[in-house]
C-alpha cells in the first residue's frame, strides 16, 4: 500500500511535471510565437486512455517528437532549452510510473496539435493531484 | 500625442458585412502589434484578433474564426477589421489596441481607441 | 482557453477607504521567458479600458501610486490604498501569456 510519503512524492513530482507542461504551452501558444503557424502542423498522437500514473508511458513515447517541435519555437517569448526542459521531463515521468512495468501504450485513432496534446497530459496531470489531496 | 481612433460602425442586417479602421497617430505604427477588443452592451471585453507588427501573422478568437479578418496598412498607419457574416451576436463597441510586446518594457495593450459602435440587427 | 475569475463583482466603498479585488486564473500565467502577463485596466463609464498595470506589479505611466497589484501563478491582487472620486468603475485583470482573455470585471462604486 502507498504510504503518505510516497503519496507525497508522487504529488510533488505531478506538480513539476504539471508546471513544465504548462511553462511549454504558455511559451508557444500565444500569439506573440512566431512559429506557432509552423508548430500547429505537426501531428501527436494521443493516448486512448490516460487515467493512472502507467498511461505516462504514452507521453514518453511522444516526448522526442515534442523536443523536436520545441526546437522551431526559440525566440524572445521562449528561452527554454528544449533538450534540457525534455530531458528533465523524462526523468519525472519515469520516476512516476515506474520503470519496472512495461506498459504496451494504445493511441486513440485520432492526432492530435501540440497544443491539444499539452492540454490533455496537463488535464491528465490535474486528475491525479486532485486524487491525491 | 498617441491617438488611435476607430470607425466604420454602424448598423447592419444579419449576414451582412462591416469594415471597421482604426487610424494611428503620435508614434510608430509599423513597430507595435496591433488587437481588436469588443464590448456587447453591458458586458465585459472579449478579445477578437491580433496582428503582427509587419502583417505576418495573424490570430483570431474562435468566435470570429473564418468570419473576420484583420489587415493593416502600414504606409497609412491603419489597422482594418472585415467582419463578414454578421450575427447579432456581434453586436458591440470595438476598440483597437496597440501591443509593444517586441519593446523592452513589453507593456502589452497599454493605448486603446474610443471605440466604434456596431449593431447587428433586422 | 485560460479563464480569468475576479471577486467580488461589486464592491461599494468609502472615499478614502482602500479597496481590493482579486482575479484567479485556471492555469499557470508564468510564461517561458520569465515574466508573468497580467494586466490589470481601469474602465469609467462610456470610456475606453486604460492600462493601469503591468506584468503583475508595475504602474504604467500615469498611474497614481495608489494602485498597486501583486500576486504570482494563478492569484493575484490589486489594491487601491485610498479609494478617490475618480477611481469609480470597472476593473478588469487579463493575461497575455497565451491568447487574451479577461476577467469579468469588478464594479467598483462609492457608497
Known amino acids: 500500500a502507498p504510504t503518505s510519503s510516497s503519496t507525497k512524492k508522487t504529488q510533488l513530482q505531478l506538480e513539476h511535471l504539471l508546471l513544465d507542461l504548462q511553462m511549454i504551452l504558455n511559451g508557444i501558444n500565444n500569439y506573440k510565437n512566431p512559429k506557432l503557424t509552423r508548430m500547429l502542423t505537426f501531428k501527436f498522437y494521443m493516448p486512448k486512455k490516460a487515467t493512472e500514473l502507467k498511461h505516462l508511458q504514452c507521453l514518453e513515447e511522444e516526448l522526442k517528437p515534442l523536443e523536436e517541435v520545441l526546437n522551431l519555437a526559440q525566440s524572445k517569448n521562449f528561452h527554454l532549452r528544449p533538450r534540457d526542459l525534455i530531458s528533465n521531463i523524462n526523468v519525472i515521468v519515469l520516476e512516476l510510473k515506474g520503470s519496472e512495468t512495461t506498459f504496451m501504450c494504445e493511441y486513440a485513432d485520432e492526432t492530435a496539435t501540440i497544443v491539444e496534446f499539452l492540454n490533455r497530459w496537463i488535464t491528465f496531470c490535474q486528475s491525479i493531484i486532485s486524487t491525491l489531496t | 500625442q498617441v491617438q488611435l481612433v476607430e470607425s466604420g460602425g454602424g448598423v447592419v442586417q444579419p449576414g451582412r458585412s462591416l469594415r471597421l479602421s482604426c487610424a494611428a497617430s503620435?508614434?510608430?505604427?509599423?513597430?507595435?502589434?496591433m488587437h481588436w477588443v469588443r464590448q456587447a452592451p453591458g458586458k465585459g471585453l472579449e478579445w477578437v484578433a491580433v496582428i503582427w507588427y509587419d502583417g505576418s501573422n495573424e490570430y483570431y478568437a474562435d468566435s470570429v474564426k473564418g468570419r473576420f479578418t484583420i489587415s493593416r496598412d502600414n504606409s497609412k498607419n491603419t489597422l482594418f477589421l472585415q467582419m463578414n457574416s454578421l450575427r447579432a451576436e456581434d453586436t458591440a463597441v470595438y476598440y483597437c489596441a496597440r501591443d509593444d510586446w517586441f519593446g523592452e518594457a513589453d507593456y502589452g495593450m497599454d493605448v486603446w481607441g474610443q471605440g466604434t459602435t456596431v449593431t447587428v440587427s433586422s | 482557453d485560460i479563464v480569468m475569475t475576479q471577486t467580488p463583482l461589486s464592491s461599494p466603498v468609502t472615499l478614502g477607504q482602500p479597496a481590493s479585488i482579486s482575479c484567479r486564473s485556471s492555469?499557470?500565467?508564468?510564461?517561458?521567458?520569465?515574466?508573468?502577463?497580467l494586466s490589470w485596466l481601469h474602465q469609467r463609464p462610456g470610456q475606453p479600458p486604460r492600462l493601469l498595470i503591468y506584468k503583475i506589479s508595475n504602474r504604467f505611466s500615469g498611474v497614481p501610486d495608489r494602485f498597486s497589484g501583486s500576486g504570482a501563478g494563478t492569484d493575484f491582487t490589486l489594491k487601491i490604498s485610498r479609494v478617490e472620486a475618480e477611481d469609480v468603475g470597472v476593473y478588469y485583470c487579463m493575461q497575455t501569456t497565451q491568447f487574451p482573455t479577461f476577467g469579468q470585471g469588478t464594479k467598483v462604486e462609492i457608497k
Open positions: 492555469q499557470i500565467l508564468v510564461n517561458s521567458d520569465g515574466n508573468t502577463y
Open positions: 503620435g508614434f510608430t505604427f509599423s513597430s507595435y502589434g
